[in-house]
Interface confidence: medium
């Protein structure tokens, strides 16, 4: 019997940067299939009780099922299978070859690197505020995750984080960043966001919704290891920095394909954040094969074997490019609208 | 939100031609597919084309070589080039897109416009 609950059952996600989200891929019959989210009798933009594929989370060493429905369309033809009978199981598919497929996708919790803050902080002399202190990041623009302004909650207290030149000289090592994005469960600190992009990046009808809050805080202690220690109260000010971060675990990732080659394997490497698909162009910070592996291992292709830079002698050659070595830490993408120099990469067929 | 609208129906004589038009407006940062889908008087909707962001087209097997669909992304929008039109063609069409919500993480969501007419006469 083939299931999703058999503990040898191999699954894996894909079409992400991150291990625990992605389109469900199944290896049954000697290869991987992309399982369509037709399958059990259910409509395709149906969305399931995650806690349903528990164990697939589990067994990828992910934490807890988030969701489980329709993925983003692939452009890509890949074995795409439609399974019938119970929910997870697989012994009975068929290959949908010419059908529109929506991809099943499934969003498991990615697992905590540190040890999470506690989740009710010890008492404290003062009686107010009794509910626990928690964190958010105000969203940005096209609803961005783990990336924004910091606002923090203590009881019904909340407000955003002054963050001053003088916070930066003390805080060279980004240690209280760190914590910040790891209780915020977004993985780890990647850069500050100036303000401007903080606050311009929200949308203009969020912005309008989103108003001041009443009070604002300050950093007590940067090398705090439990959020209420973190900062103090401030009367609020109309000037000056606030606290705004980028984690790696933003979303969206940049996906990339390669196009034009005679294999999925090779091609010139193509770049989205968002719907639009548009060349990649060749960049001086990306002169290490970290790029290209990546880009290969999206492709679900071997290693990365060679990169061609191609001419760039036409002025009104556009494309993205990525100022970070790995496309996987590029919050986003700079428009080139001349000169772009494609880039031609050849990875390992794994089916030759 | 997102609004889906079609325009471009009315009658025609079979062997004749019309195209269809479907824009998306509203949150639409993270479409991935448009469909037309057709539904015939007393039988089911049945998709009839395809297109995803990154080209790649499918058909209904009845209407390949006929009909053709395109889009244009930086409009948010699909058409349905139908030529050789038959009275089997007959059918209210219904434009659909299916957007990444407003995080554009991937989850799908669909919305589906009121459909336009289209009427072909023998």
């Known amino acids: 019997r083939l299931s999703w609950d058999d503990p040898d059952f191999q699954t894996r996600l894909t079409r992400s940067n991150s291990r625990c989200q992605g389109q469900l891929e199944v290896y049954i019959k000697y290869g991987w299939h992309m399982v369509c989210s037709q399958s059990w009798g259910r409509s395709s933009n149906q969305w399931e009780d995650p806690n349903q594929a528990s164990k697939v989370c589990q067994r990828l060493n992910c934490g807890v099922p988030l969701s489980l429905g329709p993925f983003l369309i692939t452009d890509r033809h890949q074995s795409q299978i439609t399974c019938y009978g119970r929910l997870g199981s697989f012994s009975n598919c068929s290959h949908s070859g010419r059908d529109v497929c929506r991809p099943l996708g499934l969003t498991c919790l990615e697992p905590q690197t540190t040890t999470p803050p506690p989740t009710r902080p010890p008492p404290t002399t003062t009686p107010e505020p009794t509910a626990p202190p928690r964190l958010q990041l105000v969203a940005q623009a096209a609803g961005r995750h783990c990336a924004g302004v910091v606002e923090f909650y203590s009881g019904s207290l909340g407000g955003t984080i002054s963050y001053e030149a003088q916070d930066k000289a003390q805080d060279k090592t980004q240690v209280l960043e760190n914590f910040l994005c790891s209780s915020l469960q977004c993985g780890s600190f990647l850069k500050h966001l100036p303000e401007t992009e903080a606050a311009t990046a929200q949308d203009p009808g969020e912005l309008r919704e989103h108003q001041p809050l009443p009070i604002q805080w300050t950093i007590r202690n940067s090398s705090c290891t439990s959020l209420e220690h973190c900062f103090r109260k401030i009367k609020p000010r109309n000037s000056g920095q606030v606290l705004a971060l980028l984690c790696s675990g933003f979303q969206p990732k940049v996906q990339s394909r390669l196009v034009g080659g005679s294999s999925i394997c090779e091609g010139t490497v193509e770049v989205r954040q968002g719907a639009q698909w548009a060349a990649l162009c060749d960049s001086s910070s990306a002169k290490s094969s970290l790029r290209w592996e990546e880009v290969c291992q999206e492709q679900q292709c071997g290693s990365f074997n060679s990169y061609q830079a191609l001419d760039a002698g036409d002025p009104t050659s556009r494309g993205l490019s990525c100022p970070h070595q790995k496309l996987s830490q590029c919050h986003e993408l700079t428009e080139r609208k001349s000169y772009c120099k494609k880039v031609f990469v050849t990875c390992q067929d794994p089916n030759p | 939100e997102v609004q889906v609208v079609e325009s471009g129906g009315g009658l025609v004589q079979a062997g004749g031609s019309l195209r269809l038009s479907c824009a998306a407006s509203?949150?639409?940062?993270?479409?991935?597919?448009m469909y037309w889908y057709r539904q015939a008087p007393g039988k089911a909707r049945e998709m009839v084309a395809a297109?995803?962001?990154?080209?790649?087209?499918y058909y209904e097997d009845s209407v390949m070589g006929r009909f053709t669909i395109f889009r244009e992304n930086a409009k948010n929008t699909v058409y349905l080039q139908m030529n050789s039109l038959k009275p089997e063609d007959t059918a209210v069409y219904y434009c659909?897109?299916?957007?990444?919500?407003?995080?554009?993480?991937?989850?799908?969501?669909?919305?589906w416009g009121q459909g336009t007419q289209v009427t072909v006469s023998a």
């Open positions: 659909n897109a299916d957007i990444a919500g407003h995080n554009c993480s991937g989850y799908l969501k669909e919305y």
């Open positions: 509203g949150d639409t940062i993270c479409i991935s597919a």
């Open positions: 297109i995803t962001s990154g080209g790649s087209t």
